[in-house]
Interface confidence: low
Amino acid sequence: WELTILHTNDVHSRLEQTSEDSSKCVNASRCMGGVARLFTKVQQIRRAEPNVLLLDAGDQYQGTIWFTVYKGAEVAHFMNALRYDAMALGNHEFDNGVEGLIEPLLKEAKFPILSANIKAKGPLASQISGLYLPYKVLPVGDEVVGIVGYTSKETPFLSNPGTNLVFEDEITALQPEVDKLKTLNVNKIIALGHSGFEMDKLIAQKVRGVDVVVGGHSNTFLYTGNPPSKEVPAGKYPFIVTSDDGRKVPVVQAYAFGKYLGYLKIEFDERGNVISSHGNPILLNSSIPEDPSIKADINKWRIKLDNYSTQELGKTIVYLDGSSQSCRFRECNMGNLICDAMINNNLRHTDEMFWNHVSMCILNGGGIRSPIDERNNGTITWENLAAVLPFGGTFDLVQLKGSTLKKAFEHSVHRYGQSTGEFLQVGGIHVVYDLSRKPGDRVVKLDVLCTKCRVPSYDPLKMDEVYKVILPNFLANGGDGFQMIKDELLRHDSGDQDINVVSTYISKMKVIYPAVEGRIKFS
């Protein structure tokens, strides 16, 4: 019996087609993805093949103005229109709190939403009961397939699930659910979830009875043969893991941002064992036409977005200096504003010992693309912020050793004075440079804000200590020459859309007046 699994993950609000790098579509003839194009391909496969499942491995929420404005209603509407069969909860589904998940998505979705390792307690337990499930059995042709869900147990550090949801260890939580499915005579089981490729492989290895793992969170691109675009494969598609009980378990993921549709064909024997698996992600490029009815619907929903981008989010009473002449050479107040917003967006008081789990921010000055003039009645709009942060990136959480941070700050000024983008803006960090010293030895003082303290204060950076830092995904991926971050990071979790972080902060503060306050000094 053959099953076709179509899958997406980490779509992050890319409802419209995007450019090749998943930013805003500029030249339509070269754009990719989007739900209208995805629908065309899904329908084509549904017509051609008998047993098809369309699955999503989480993180539909967060990433563009679509989510900012519609807050998840757009996800439910268009996933319903595409007739998804199931979705796993990702960490970003909790970005607007549990209410922001329940009302727009859980109550509106016409497909099961899954996670076996999230347990509700207290008053929330009854409120959320039945709105998401640990697993779902789906009839496919003449057979049944069990789908069991999972979500990153780091979600409390990455999003806003509140105190009434407990995120358990994935493997511990999945095993009894799979065992339960087995008792229901379900012998074809897919683990669908959002914990990253390393955890996906562990689940394939450790959870008895899981036949296939469909993952997300790490934006992993797998491909067999010559890849069709710029993404470099992390391995073959599917990635085969040998389980502890000797089975070959295919593991798949489909990069991110709706650029690809994962396409996996599985052949099962009559006992539900996987005989063969093959496939590849399908690049959703302009050779695939956008479905006209979905496209028309997108255009209808779009109108509200255009109105939103010119509305006032808040006010500034000072000039927000985002000029290259400032932000690539010295501390600039736009850099301070953005870093303050990044830290504010990551306030998670999860432990009495720590006032917060993270206190530090770094931001490449080259990522700040425009100032904002206060003389326009102080008004700040989404449109203004889009000029400052035009690349559609995210502000991510990483864990780094102090020694890596020191290298990053040396890199920040290794060729100082050439108006290059790697000069770092900061938050929760005091750095002093001596430019008379040779490159690689210019950081003379580097103090960081403590987290394990009731009164935050600045202490010297310790080389062997592991620190959490918020930074742009561009830096986490080694951009602007920050190879040491990419090579040495100990953990990397994708965060919220950059503009959304800053706009939320400005809306919250109402009036802002960031200063240049001595975070970066030259001796």
Epitope: S324, Q325, G366, Q418, S419, D480
Partner: antibody, heavy 119, light 107 residues
Framework: QAYLQQSGAALVRPGASVKMSCKSS????????IHWVKQTPRQGLEWIGA????????SYNQKFKGKATLTVDKSSNTAYMQLSSLTSEDSAVYFC????????????WGQGTTLTVSS | DIQMTQSSSSFSVSLGDRVTLSCKAS??????LAWYQQKPGNAPRLLIS???SLETGVPSRFSGSGSGKDYTLSITSLQTEDVATYYC?????????FGGGNKLEIN
């Protein structure tokens, strides 16, 4: 489509100065750098410097500081390069080229201005 | 300054050949590398930026690769119109510098 039109060939005496022009069209002049590049058979292609018309910011190759002076006239979308105290070593083809402010590769080039310094 | 070295200034090639041109930087340039084609009497023409990104209108027989200090331009099947001089250029550190060029000549 961007287009860069350079001034015609020049024959000048040693010790004199020359000012060549590069008129841009087909794009927003103030949002890209104008770079100047020297080409000789002996030295190949050498970057002289760049000017950003948006704010007048100039960066020079140290080798050409004192030799080349870059200016722009935003009203006519024209960039200029003046070369002073000319010697036979300055005989070359000089190109202007457009480049992004951050990523300085040159996507559109002028046709070149041939400068001959001879008595 | 970063030196860009293109080994051997001229190549004797045949039409239909696969041609590989190399370019070595004196230090790491973090993939900030462009390739240009220049024909006699003309300005250089940008072929590739960012090591691998083909400019619009550049035939797909051209491709770029490399990282760190070592980069390559490949032409899969040389056509008459490809006979030209090819230059690499780094745009990582000011002053931006070019290689000495590789001149392709038909043998």
């Amino acid at each position: 489509q961007a287009y860069l039109q350079q001034s015609g060939a020049a024959l000048v005496r040693p010790g004199a100065s020359v000012k060549m022009s590069c008129k841009s069209s087909g794009y927003t002049f103030t949002t890209y750098n104008i770079h100047w590049v020297k080409q000789t058979p002996r030295q190949g292609l050498e970057w002289i410097g760049a000017i950003f018309p948006g704010n007048g910011h100039i960066s020079y190759n140290q080798k050409f500081k004192g030799k080349a002076t870059l200016t722009v006239d935003k009203s006519s979308n024209t960039a200029y390069m003046q070369l002073s105290s000319l010697t036979s070593e300055d005989s070359a083809v000089y190109f202007c080229a457009r480049g992004d402010y951050d990523e300085s590769y040159f996507d559109y080039w002028g046709q070149g201005t041939t400068l001959t310094v001879s008595s | 300054d970063i030196q860009m070295t293109q080994s051997s200034s001229s190549f004797s090639v045949s039409l239909g050949d696969r041609v590989t041109l190399s370019c070595k930087a004196s230090e790491g340039i973090y993939n900030r590398l462009a390739w240009y084609q220049q024909k006699p009497g003309n300005a250089p023409r940008l072929l590739i930026s960012g090591v691998i990104s083909l400019e619009t209108g550049v035939p797909s027989r051209f491709s770029g690769s490399g990282s760190g200090k070592d980069y390559t331009l490949s032409i899969t099947s040389l056509q008459t119109e490809d006979v030209a001089t090819y230059y690499c250029q780094q745009y990582w550190s000011i002053p931006w510098t070019f290689g000495g060029g590789n001149k392709l000549e038909i043998n």
